[in-house]
Interface confidence: low
């Protein structure tokens, strides 16, 4: 009977870690000679299995090839890895007496596609916090997937963003692939509660995409608005000054009261008020004993937020010398300050 080597499947897909069978049947055992499995073609092809009884990790013949009438030379590869991807050929050789065995026929080849899941996407952002209206880049990386086809999308608070760049490497054929995508986001002051999501869809994920999340609270700084106001006097000898730092993030805040440029009180906020947008407010009260001041006094509220340069607001309290009523004091904000509030 004429020899024919048949590999019925053009391709098989297998998930990493699973087993696959590569089928190969012959129509004749003649001429005498071995059957071998190779991956690839040409001089660099790799011998996979030769039915010579030797132990090959993860590969077994499916049927008993020692039987005289066996025509089935299929093999099972177990615990498949992305490195097993490629085209496998079942090849019949004619045994040589003195010279090497001669290849006389090959099957058509079976391509093994190894389906490997992408790793959970990791989203990284800038090392330093950005400020509202600044553009910052986020990068999403996932690796180890196969085949190469993959979809990556970016979202911010449910709205799709377009990436600056998305690359899948390597560009040629490979056992597995990596994806990297960068998106640029415009920060705004309401972003403390916002999230940037990188979503990866792949054939191995069965319509359940993987997601990587970056909380913008880790990447944004909202500087406080600072106001100094005078409250109604609680008694004849006292003036209440209030320094209010509003809508800041993160929580790191130091507040110092100064009298005529000299530190009067260090205030380390403990009970911050949280706003619905995720930012914080803090109010510091400073009780001024009016009887202690006959001259004008400039009170300064100095706010240091998140290691940034201090924000200062001045408020001048007029001493008794300016007042006809000995039981009261006058105050007004310093009009020479860069920013003034009444």
């Amino acid at each position: 009977k004429e020899l024919k080597v048949t590999q019925p499947e053009k391709s098989v897909s297998v998930a990493a870690g699973d087993s696959t069978v590569l089928n190969c049947t012959l129509t004749s055992l003649l001429p005498v000679g071995p059957i071998r499995w190779y991956r690839g073609v040409g001089p660099s092809r790799l011998l996979i299995y030769s039915f010579a009884g030797e132990y090959v990790p993860r590969i077994r013949n499916v049927s008993d090839t020692t039987k005289r009438n066996n025509m089935d030379f299929s093999i099972r590869i177990s615990n498949v890895t992305p490195a097993d991807a490629g085209i496998y050929y079942c090849v019949k050789f004619q045994k040589g007496s003195s010279e090497p065995d001669t290849e006389i026929q090959s099957g058509g080849g079976t391509e093994v596609y190894v389906l490997a899941k992408p790793s959970p996407p990791e989203v990284s952002g800038p090392a330093d916090r950005g400020i509202p209206d600044q553009k910052v880049n986020f990068t999403c990386k996932s690796h180890g997937f196969s085949p190469r086809n993959i979809t990556l999308k970016w979202f911010k608070d449910g709205q799709e963003l377009h990436p600056l760049e998305t690359t899948v490497n390597p560009s040629g054929k490979n056992v597995s692939y990596n994806i990297s995508s960068t998106v640029r986001v415009v920060l705004n002051s309401m972003d403390v509660n916002s999230k940037v999501i990188c979503e990866v869809a792949h054939i191995t994920l069965d319509r359940s995409p993987l997601r990587g999340i970056a909380n913008l609270s880790n990447f944004i700084r909202v500087s406080p608005t600072v106001k100094v106001t005078q409250q109604s006097p609680t008694s004849m000898n006292q003036v209440n000054l209030t320094c209010r730092a509003e809508r800041f993030y993160p929580e790191d805040l130091q507040l110092i009261w100064l009298e005529n440029g000299n530190v009067s009180r260090n205030d380390t906020p403990k009970n911050l008020t949280k706003n619905t947008d995720g930012t914080y407010n803090y109010t510091s009260l400073f009780l001024v004993n009016s009887s202690a001041h006959r001259e004008d006094v400039v009170f300064t509220c100095q706010v240091k937020h998140d290691q940034q340069p201090a924000i200062t607001r001045n408020h001048t309290v007029l001493g008794f010398a300016h007042s006809s009523d000995q039981g009261s004091m006058q105050t007004f904000p310093d009009n020479n300050a860069t920013h003034n509030w009444n």
Partner: antibody, heavy 119, light 107 residues
Framework: QVQLQESGPGLVKPSQTLSLTCTVS??????????WSWIRQHPGKGLEWIGS???????YYNPSLKSRVTISVDTSKNQFSLKLSSVTAADTAVYYC???????????WGQGTTVTVSS | DIQMTQSPSSLSASVGDRVTITCQAS??????LNWYQQKPGKAPKLLIY???NLATGVPSRFSGSGSGTDFTFTISSLQPEDIATYYC?????????FGGGTKVEIK
């Protein structure tokens, strides 16, 4: 290749709303990857960015014009539009639409349309 | 807003000359800077993006460099068709802002 074409009235009366449309040909707004922008140029002056829109409707506006500007997109017609309300003579300019890629700048521009605000 | 200061505002050079235009940002904008060419009566044309990348189809005599606050645009050998006004534009911070322009003329 992608081409942009502005259209709209060349003369608008003060206090009225300026309306312009940019028609995109040779490519789909919905394909993503780009913002679609409006820029203007006052006579003999430099360029001023008005705002940009993504196909999903996400917009960015120049704060100096934000209270008067609306940019919208109609993906079915492959168009995006600019509305500028309460115009004055200071809004007289050449108005350009452009395609904006963050990584590639404003790489495609319309030829521009002159809008004069006058009674 | 980020202020973009371009200099000079105009220049005159001979064909074949090397022409340099500078653009200074009021704060650090990394490499988020584009350069455009605008000929009279025409729309601007993108020449350089991300400070130093040549846009598609732009002759190699045009180049850009710089990062942070100081940027340079160079025409290595001025050609008659290069008569135009050149603008820088930052896209690091909203709103996007342009330089005042540099008008290039032939002597």
């Amino acid at each position: 290749q992608v081409q942009l074409q502005e259209s709209g009235p060349g003369l608008v009366k003060p206090s009225q709303t300026l309306s312009l449309t940019c028609t995109v040909s040779g490519g789909s707004i919905s394909s993503g990857g780009y913002y679609w922008s409006w820029i203007r140029q006052h006579p003999g002056k430099g360029l001023e960015w008005i705002g940009s829109i993504y196909y999903s409707g996400s917009t960015y506006y120049n704060p100096s014009l934000k209270s008067r500007v609306t940019i919208s997109v109609d993906t079915s017609k492959n168009q995006f539009s600019l509305k500028l309300s309460s115009v004055t003579a200071a809004d007289t300019a050449v108005y350009y639409c452009a395609r904006e890629g963050y990584h590639s700048g404003m790489d495609v521009w319309g030829q521009g349309t002159t809008v004069t605000v006058s009674s | 807003d980020i202020q973009m200061t371009q200099s000079p505002s105009s220049l005159s050079a001979s064909v074949g000359d090397r022409v340099t235009i500078t653009c200074q940002a009021s704060q650090d904008i990394s490499n988020y800077l584009n350069w455009y060419q605008q000929k009279p009566g025409k729309a601007p044309k993108l020449l350089i993006y991300d400070a130093s990348n040549l846009a598609t189809g732009v002759p190699s005599r045009f180049s850009g460099s710089g990062s942070g606050t100081d940027f340079t645009f160079t025409i290595s050998s001025l050609q008659p068709e290069d008569i135009a006004t050149y603008y820088c534009q930052q896209f690091a911070y909203l709103p996007w802002t342009f330089g005042g322009g540099t008008k290039v003329e032939i002597k």
